[in-house]
Each structure stands twice: as structure tokens, then as C-alpha cells.
Amino acid sequence: QPPPPPPDATCHQVRSFFQRLQPGLKWVPETPVPGSDLQVCLPKGPTCCSRKMEEKYQLTARLNMEQLLQSASMELKFLIIQNAAVFQEAFEIVVRHAKNYTNAMFKNNYPSLTPQAFEFVGEFFTDVSLYILGSDINVDDMVNELFDSLFPVIYTQLMNPGLPDSALDINECLRGARRDLKVFGNFPKLIMTQVSKSLQVTRIFLQALNLGIEVINTTDHLKFSKDCGRMLTRMWYCSYCQGLMMVKPCGGYCNVVMQGCMAGVVEIDKYWREYILSLEELVNGMYRIYDMENVLLGLFSTIHDSIQYVQKNAGKLTTTIGKLCAHSQQRQYR
Amino acid sequence: SAYYPEDLFIDKKVLKVAHVEHEETLSSRRRELIQKLKSFISFYSALPGYICSHSPVAENDTLCWNGQELVERYSQKAARNGMKNQFNLHELKMKGPEPVVSQIIDKLKHINQLLRTMSMPKGRVLDKNLDEEGFESGDCGDDEDECIGGSGDGMIKVKNQLRFLAELAYDLDVDDAPGNSQQATPKDNEISTFHNLGNVH
């Protein structure tokens, strides 16, 4: 049974509702019309809707849907954005502390190596920061560069203080000797392993959080299809055409429509669940050498031990290096 | 306050870092995040239901709209889309996700693979090859105190290495302090949009 036409057989009530959506436009018929041109709200009898109104309803329906989606994801989005920012800031603070601790170790134990050591330490921790943020830097190279840079200064300041200030050519020979003779023992390898493991995990943790934001942003700004727009219009607005302003859609019908509109989005579900569970697994494993806070804040100690190792073997090393880098040293003395 | 580098007497193998009761560490913050994220594990599957519950639907009314006509809420017609031949709901589902959704699914697959690769079996502290080289530091036995270093004359214990307070208020070196970098944390009671979307059906 078609519902009765609006009171007094006018479309007055429909007009006042539509005015809220589209103020000032005269698209609402004065009295119910056949509505043969309608494509979505197909009438069973006279209707208070025109083709233009239908288009406006479709636009509004899709807009409503987008707003509902955005409000649905607001808390989740805020949670991830907030944490991504907090963790990035926290990791940078850890790096800054680690740098300060390492500089303090040099200042207190090896004042003759400063300020050069400060610069090498600064470079190392700069690269650490950049690596965490996703830069294409090799951790082993970073650690090698730190020890390559430190050794010429240790050699000329601690082991062989008689040498003049080191020039680049003897430095290069000393850098080569550092690796060939394993002057720091296994400490560089230990640091490489610990730093690379902890930084890799930290980096992927931040990457995962940033991807979480991207996922929410993507689904947040989805543009719904015309088909979906028609379904939503029929569910939310077609009742108006019959003057049924206060009627609400049936719950089961709404679910069917939403599942149709969101079929694509719901496909993310499986991978989203896996994402959260995989992230949990990663976080559970972030301790000891997989925890950058633990590793970086302890680096000063390992570097200190590595320099002590060099000092213990200084006699033997000085003789060997004296022969190895004799050519460079002669050039420097001239 | 945290000690400045001048206050770190490394030669005495002592590292003082302020300890605050009930402080929030980075690892506890990570775990807290995971717990909160897990309450959103059903976010996407629950979305259709969430949107229906947050848009006008007939809950207590006897009559409701099924897209074509007014029907009784519990009748068979209530769930049926009244407009047959308009377009097929099944077709809409068959179209598959939009390209942007497919792209994000690919990215999720990739990160999930990376996360799985990186996740370490519980209890493994150091790699075998490092253990063999004699760098295994042994278990400190106390979650609060982590061993750092691993050779030389005695280990350094760092008590709760960083106090990770919600607003990241560290006593940093003046020349190292970031300008206006304090980050407020969302308080649970400030969030009113919705809770536990995963539980909405």
C-alpha cells in the first residue's frame, strides 16, 4: 500500500526539510508529481522529489558516509599519530643521551682525544638518527666509520704522542691498519651486531606506526561509488519523497547497504588484524640487544672497553703499524 | 633531574640516572600502545555495524523504512532492499576494492612480512656467534636493571635508563634541548568519539 500523500496534498514539509540541505533553491515541487524522471527514489505514486533533489540527496548521502567514516576512525587515528610522534621524539632523545654519555666518557677518560672524538661521535649518532628515520645507511658502515675515525686520533694522541698532528694520508693508512690488524678486537663486531639489531627493530617499529596512519588516512578519505551513493540515498532520503520525515531505516537493511558500500574496505580486515598481532610480537621481542634504549645508552661503556683493549696491546701494535705506515709517516715528517 | 655529562663518572663505572617511582619506560609505553591497538583489532570488520549504529536506524519504532516502503521492523521485508532491478548489491560487492585500498593492502602485507621477519623468539638474548666470542653478558636477573657492556672490569647497571614521562620532560643539556618539543599524551577521558569499536556488532 502506498503511503498517503502529505497533508493538504502539498509538499510543504518536504520543502522545509530540503531547504536545510540546499537553502534558497526551488527544486521541490509545490504538490506531488508523477516523478517519472527519478532514477533512485522510484515512486509507487505521486512524489515530492524532483531529479535535481535526488542528485542533491545522493551528494549529501555520500558526504554523510565520508563523515561517519572519519568520525569512526578518529580515536584510532589519534592514537597512532600521537604515539608515532611520541616514539620518534623519544628515540631522538635516547640518541641524544647516548651521544652525551659517550662524549662524557671521552671527556672524563681521554681528554686528549677531544674535541675530535666529539665530532666522530656526533657523526655516528647523526647517522643513527637518520637510520631510525628510514635513511639508506648501512649500520656496519656507520660503526666502521666510527672506529676508522677514532683510531688515527688514538694512535697519534695516546699510543704515539710524538707524532705531529695527523694528516689525511697517514690517517688513511691508520684506518686501513685498524681493520687489517683488528686493533679494537671484536668490539666493533659486537657493536655492529647490537646496534644493527636494535636499530632495525626500532626503525621497523616506527615504519609500522607510520603505515598504520597511512592505512587509516586511506580508508578515511575513500570516495564512495555512485552505486553506493544510490543505495545510501534510497536508505536515508527516499522516504522524504513520500513525506515520511521521521521514519528511520530498518537495522537489517542498513547493515546490508553498509556491507555493500564497504565491501572493499572490509577486505583490509584480515591484514589489519595481522598487522596488530605482528606489531605485538615485535614489541614483545624489543628487549636486551633488540632494545635501542638499552643498546645505545650502553655504547659508551663498550667504546671505553674497546679503547682499553687498544691500550693493552699498544706496544705490539705500535711496532707493526710503524712498519705498515712508515711511508706515510716519512712523508708527514718532511 | 637527569645528570649532565660532567656528572657521569665513567672511570668509576657509575652512571647515575634519576629514578622516579612508577615512571613510564619506553617499553611499558610500547606495551600500552599495543594493548590499546588490540581493542581496535576488529575495526574494519566492525565498520558497517558501527556506521549503522551511528546513523539514524529504527531501534524502538515499530515501523521502519526498507528503501521502498514502510514495513514492520521484524518482518522479512525489513532487511530486503525494496528496489529490485535498480542495481545488484552482489555486483557492488564483486567489483572488489578500489585501487587505493588494494595498494594499502599490499603495503600492509609487506610490513606484516617485515614485522614477522624481525620478531625475535622469546628468550633469545644474543646471537650464537656472539656468545661464542665471549661477549655474552649473562642474565642480570632483574627487569629493572639491565646489564650494559660486556667486558672490561665490571658491568655498568643503568637503572631504568630513561624515565619516559608522558610529556617527555627530560633534563637535557641546555645546548641539546629541543625547542618546544614537549608532546602531550591523549588522556583517556578526553576521547569521546567511541571506544572498542571492535566490540560493536
Epitope: 666522530f120 657523526e123 647523526t126 637518520l130 675515525s149 684506518r175 | -
Partner: antibody, heavy 116, light 102 residues
Framework: QVTLKESGPTLVKPTQTLTLTCTFS??????????VGWIRQPPGKALEWLAL???????RYSPSLKSRLTITKDTSKNQVVLTMTNMDPVDTATYYC?????????????WGQGTL | QSVLTQPPSASVAPGKTARITCGGN??????VHWYQQKPGQSPVLVIY???KRPSGIPERFSGSNSGNTATLTISGAQPMDEADYYC?????????FGGGTK
Amino acid sequence: QVTLKESGPTLVKPTQTLTLTCTFSGFSLSTSGVGVGWIRQPPGKALEWLALIYWNDDKRYSPSLKSRLTITKDTSKNQVVLTMTNMDPVDTATYYCAHSRIAARRVLDYWGQGTL
Amino acid sequence: QSVLTQPPSASVAPGKTARITCGGNNIGSKSVHWYQQKPGQSPVLVIYQDTKRPSGIPERFSGSNSGNTATLTISGAQPMDEADYYCQAWYSTIMVFGGGTK
């Protein structure tokens, strides 16, 4: 797009201090991984690096000129300033500032037009 | 005297392959960048991190680096490629340029 422009006096008397300003756009010196460097080139000669400042305010100087150079940044104004004390006729050169990608091993990927 | 050694000049017939070398002790362990500078102009980055080409740089420019020599190669050199070429590397905390090749 990234642009940099050097400005400063064209003529400086011996023993005086040279102050050069690099004004840039298209990037921010508060972005992680960004740096700005100064390089000079005496007429008909090779490029010589002077100084580099990082986003985190770390500074690096040429060892041979370190005692005479100071590099500073003003992030809000998008400017980097280089001062060089005790100028000498041998310091006559075109002075360039350049954008540096610190992560890409300190490459200088965008250069200013230079100031003589 | 620069720690990175470049030949002062190099010449090649149009369409042929030009190779410019940059020598340095164990330079293969460094990342080397190459710049092109035409008369009266600012330098332009043509190769970075040994082998990478910035966008807008023709494919004829390529780079390699191993042992004690880094090389910039211009395959099918053109008259417009006539310029000074500088190699650059980062030594710990110091930026070093080669002496340039015309």
C-alpha cells in the same frame, strides 16, 4: 622547488670579518637529514669546502680554516650565516652555499648561484 | 694538495666514451659524489653515492668506485658535456673535493 641565494659584501678589507648569508626556500633546516654547506672557489681554481651545519645544529668545519669560521642557522628565517674572520686577499673567491642530504653521505644536491 | 687526485684535463671525441678518475687511498670504502661545473655557473650534481644519478641527469652519466679509484663515465659524450668535473667524498667529519678535471 629548492633554491638557495648567497648575499654579503662584494669587498672586504684585509683583517676584517666577512659575513655571508644563505637564504633558502623549498626545504626546512628543522627537517631530519637536512644540512646546508658553504664552499668557495678562488678564480680559476678548484672547489674548497668551508663548513656544514646539520638540522640538529651539529657543525663541521674545514680543519685548515676552523679557527676563522663560524656557521649558524636561523630556522625560522630559513637562513644560514657564515662568518670568516681575519680576511686576506687569498680569500678572494666565489662563495657558494648548498643544500646537503646528510644521509646520502653529505652530498650537495642543490647549489646557490654564488657571491664573489 | 688534495687527498683526492684527479687528472687536470681529459679529452674525448664527440660520441665516444669519456672516463674521469678520482684517486684516493681506499676510496672504495667511501661514498663518492661528482659535480659538473660549466664556465660562469654553479656546480651541478651529476652522480652521488658512487653510482646514483639525480633526476634530470642524462643516462650517459654513470659512476663506479672500488679500491683506490672512483670513476665518472660519460658514454657518448656530447659537446654540451664540456665542463669542469669535481669528485667529492666525506672523510669522517671533513668534506674533501678533488682538484677538478677539465
